[in-house]
């Protein structure tokens, strides 16, 4: 089980539940945009594959400044096992690629997607 | 409700080089990805490139020494320029929203025909 | 290069089941995206990513992909859907690009 830090539903949340809820939030952020996704700050590309979670969060967390994507990194907090912290960097980053949050938020949208209907939750 | 058109000469000489402009209008062009497609006639569908509003492009590699695409977020146009122009490059070319959520494209413009003939 | 592979034609009936595919490396790992295009208009979205539907988009469109090959399915086919359908993939590698198949024409006999 997975515990969301700073979500309003108190106790553990499936994992099942905050996959879709993440998904939800990230096609939320991307509808009617009025200007570019945290003014189209780049950041890490990732590998999608295992530890992700962690991976992603450790790309978004060097973005300051940007309250559209607050509740992604929230919602990633409670994904990732571990602690993670601006600067830091695991082997899942493609490190000679830097790319806009808004296409790193598809890419990641798409995968999770992907995860989504194959049932893999974990 | 966003529209796209697309404009520019009908007719170009060999050689020569395309400017085509696209005028969004219904929403705000500078919080997408912008792409130019091309359609010979009786021909599947080409990417030519896409650019953001950062002005960050990525270009077709087989036509990339030809491409040149900018972005015009105050009169919310985007532009195409294509040069040494040669008959095979005869084509409705359209301008297109990559959507917000994914790699897709979401509005289309009605398309402008071009064809290189001297 | 990334090369999708679709076929030219597709023939069925009204009321039947259509299904058009799509071939590619692996594309099971990449969002396909479809497009329908009628004589002489812009291509319309009908799936993305694999087998969502934009809003005002029959539920008669569906989608699938996985392995080698996305389908595109429409079901209870009408007249009004004879049209060229096309798939779509971004390639994101060190050179990022769009890739369209080459087209597959749907008739309704």
């Known amino acids: 089980l997975t515990c969301l830090g700073g979500f309003a539903s108190p106790g553990p949340v499936p994992p099942s539940t905050a996959l879709r809820e993440l998904i939800e939030e990230l096609v939320n952020i991307t509808q009617n945009q009025k200007a570019p996704l945290c003014n189209g700050s780049m950041v890490w590309s990732i590998n999608l594959t295992a530890g992700m979670y962690c991976a992603a969060l450790e790309s978004l967390i060097n973005v300051s400044g940007c309250s559209a994507i607050y509740r992604t990194q929230r919602i990633l907090h409670g994904l990732c096992p571990h602690k993670v912290s601006a600067g830091q960097f695991s082997s899942l980053h493609v490190r000679d690629t830097k790319i806009e949050v808004a296409q790193f938020v598809k890419d990641l949208l798409l995968h999770l997607k992907k995860l989504f209907r194959e049932g893999q939750f974990n | 409700q966003v529209q796209l058109q697309e404009s520019g000469p009908g007719l170009v000489k060999p050689s020569e080089t395309l400017s085509l402009t696209c005028s969004v209008s219904g929403g705000s062009i500078s919080s997408y990805y912008w792409s130019w497609i091309r359609q010979p006639a009786g021909k599947g569908l080409e990417w030519i490139g896409r650019i953001y509003m950062t002005g960050r492009t990525n270009y077709n590699s087989s036509l990339k020494s030809r491409v040149t695409m900018s972005i015009d977020t105050s009169k919310n146009q985007l532009s195409l320029k294509l040069s040494f122009m040669t008959a095979a490059d005869t084509a409705v070319y359209y301008c297109?929203?990559?959507?917000?959520?994914?790699?897709?494209?979401?509005?289309w413009g009605q398309g402008t025909l071009v064809t290189v003939s001297s | 290069s990334y090369v999708l592979t679709q076929p030219p034609s597709v023939s069925v009936a009204p009321g039947q089941t259509a299904r058009i595919t799509c071939g590619g490396n692996?594309?099971?790992?990449?969002?396909v995206h479809w497009y329908q295009q009628k004589p002489g208009q812009a291509p319309v979205l009908v799936v993305y990513?694999?087998?969502d539907r934009p809003s005002g988009i029959p539920e008669r469109f569906s989608g699938s992909n996985s392995g080698n090959t996305a389908t595109l399915t429409i079901s209870r086919v009408e007249a009004g859907d004879e049209a060229d359908y096309y798939c779509?993939?971004?390639?994101?590698?060190?050179?990022?690009?769009?890739?369209f198949g080459g087209g597959t024409k749907l008739t309704v006999v």
């Open positions: 779509q993939v971004w390639v994101s590698s060190s050179d990022h690009h769009v890739v």
């Open positions: 990513d694999d087998s």
């Open positions: 692996n594309i099971g790992s990449k969002g």
């Open positions: 297109a929203r990559e959507s917000g959520s994914s790699y897709s494209y979401d509005y």
